[in-house]
């Protein structure tokens, strides 16, 4: 057991197995469930994280249960197919050969079909609206302080460039964080807004994905900001294709 092995961890993803067996004895970490090598300097893609989550034995999960106020989107949990870069494949199917198309954050954007269903391209989610309700406080948070704190959080914890935090809206007790990132704006090395939103979602549920780090401790001018519910809305560059039957 060497010092190199002690250092060989993945700070940004605890759902990994790491060992110093990379090129030249360098540390290499692989995502659970897929075995894909991950870049531990940044966020792991949501697809690989969902795959790791589904592969973990139900009784051996190290993740904390969400508190009583957290809403769990059970529809959103499935064992996804990821491409070699860790992105969602445009078409997802379950074990019973039911298939559907997803966007870049893995959310279904068509009716379900069979194996003949075609999904021509992975449609990018370019606008994410995170809708939060905070627990009651003695007085409302100062809007500009709240704005600065959330921008700081997304930069420092989730590595997202501030230019992708389009706006922070606040009407006590509702906070809305708007993330925007077009295909043309996203450079190599930029964190994807979908991945940042997923890490944030898991953080506010008390299920941090970071290695050995304390949970999310959000404070605005020293006052704790405790989230009691989260809703996330996704807007794609191409509108989804659902039949009228689903809309009624």
């Amino acid at each position: 057991h060497t010092a190199a092995q002690d250092n060989c961890t993945c700070p940004t993803n605890k759902m990994t197995v790491c060992s110093p067996d990379g090129p030249g004895g360098r540390c290499q970490c692989r995502a659970l469930g897929s075995g894909v090598a991950v870049d531990c300097s940044t966020l792991t893609s949501k697809c690989l994280l969902l795959k790791a989550r589904m592969s973990a034995p139900k009784n051996a999960r190290t993740l904390v249960r969400p508190n009583e106020h957290a809403l769990v989107d059970n529809d959103g949990l499935y064992d996804p197919d990821c491409d070699p870069e860790g992105r969602f494949k445009a078409r997802q199917c379950n074990q019973t050969s039911v298939c559907w198309c997803v966007n870049s954050v893995g959310v279904r954007r068509t009716d379900k079909g069979d194996l003949s269903l075609r999904c021509d391209e992975l449609v990018r989610t370019h606008h994410i609206l995170i809708d939060l309700r905070h627990r009651p406080t003695a007085s409302a948070f100062n809007h500009s302080d709240l704005d600065a704190e959330l921008r700081r959080l997304f930069r420092e914890r989730y590595r997202l460039h501030p230019k992708f935090v389009a706006a922070v809206h606040y009407e006590q007790p509702t906070i809305q964080i708007e993330l925007r990132q077009n295909t043309s704006q996203k450079a190599a090395g930029d964190v994807d807004i979908g991945d940042a939103a997923y890490y944030f979602e898991r953080d506010v549920k008390g299920e941090s994905l970071f290695q050995g780090r304390g949970g999310l401790d959000l404070r605005v001018r020293g006052e704790p900001l405790q989230v009691e519910r989260t809703l996330i809305y996704y807007l794609d560059e191409i509108p989804p294709k659902f039949s009228m039957k689903r809309l009624t």
């Epitope: 250092n7 060989c8 110093p20 360098r26 540390c27 870049d39 300097s41 420092e156």
Partner: antibody, heavy 122, light 109 residues
Framework: QQLEESGGGLVKPEGSLTLTCKGS????????WMWWVRQAPGKGLEWIA?????????TYYASWAKGRFTISSTSSTAVTLQATSLTAADTATYFC???????????????WGPGTLVTVSS | FEMTQTPSSVSEPVGGTVTIKCQAS??????LGWYQQKPGQPPKLLIY???TLASGVPSRFKGSGSGTEFTLTISDLEPADAATYYC????????????FGGGTEVVVK
């Protein structure tokens, strides 16, 4: 714990060179960033590029360095910087430095090498 | 993005106080470091996180500020404090711009 740069010297204009940074007393296979920073004679400091030496090998480059400089880490004990199409403006002392955190956007340099002088002249 | 450091040079007597300012063109929270560099030597980290003293650095060095305005104050100046001081951030490294300030030469009379 220390860092040492090597590979500096006299290079002709339009020439190339490879600088190497080796660490002793610690392993590069950790969760931090290694940086190259340079300083022209009598001038200030400017960063060239960092590389993550944990799992992943992420890199960033200063705008002016893209295309001419390449940072890499092929082993757990060394980081290299390759430079091409050198001009007199690249004459400088080249330092390697270790970033103190695994987050590149919150990095400070808590360990520096003594530097190696690169002179570009015909 | 730009880091502007002032003044470029300052001269104070032994026992005096020097104040160096660094201004970021965008909010960088408290992600700022201060370095001391003497001729022929690499820089030495003095302060990180805008106000936290690095190991072994005397308490005469004090960092303050957050957001866009930062200050390094050196009190009870000693001859050994004669050096060039730099501020630095990596907050906007993905924009490819230099995160170092231009430097301040401190002369101790």
């Amino acid at each position: 714990q220390q860092l040492e740069e090597s590979g500096g010297g006299l290079v002709k204009p339009e020439g190339s060179l490879t600088l190497t940074c080796k660490g002793s007393g610690f392993d590069f296979s950790g969760t931090y960033w290694m940086w190259w920073v340079r300083q022209a004679p009598g001038k200030g400091l400017e960063w060239i590029a960092p590389i993550y030496v944990g799992s992943g090998s992420s890199t960033y480059y200063a705008s002016w360095a893209k295309g001419r400089f390449t940072i890499s880490s092929t082993s757990s004990t060394a980081v290299t910087l390759q430079a091409t199409s050198l001009t007199a403006a690249d004459t400088a002392t080249y330092f390697c430095a270790r970033g103190a955190t695994n987050n590149v956007f919150m990095n400070y340099f808590n360990l520096w090498g003594p530097g190696t002088l690169v002179t570009v002249s015909s | 993005f730009e880091m502007t450091q002032t003044p470029s040079s300052v001269s104070e007597p032994v026992g005096g106080t020097v104040t160096i300012k660094c201004q970021a063109s965008e909010d960088i929270s408290s992600n700022l470091g201060w370095y001391q560099q003497k001729p022929g030597q690499p820089p030495k980290l003095l302060i990180y996180g805008a106000s936290t003293l690095a190991s072994g650095v005397p308490s005469r060095f004090k960092g303050s500020g957050s957001g866009t305005e930062f200050t390094l104050t050196i009190s009870d100046l000693e001859p050994a404090d004669a050096a060039t001081y730099y501020c630095q951030t990596s907050y906007y490294i993905d924009d490819g711009v230099n995160g170092f300030g231009g430097g301040t030469e401190v002369v101790v009379k």
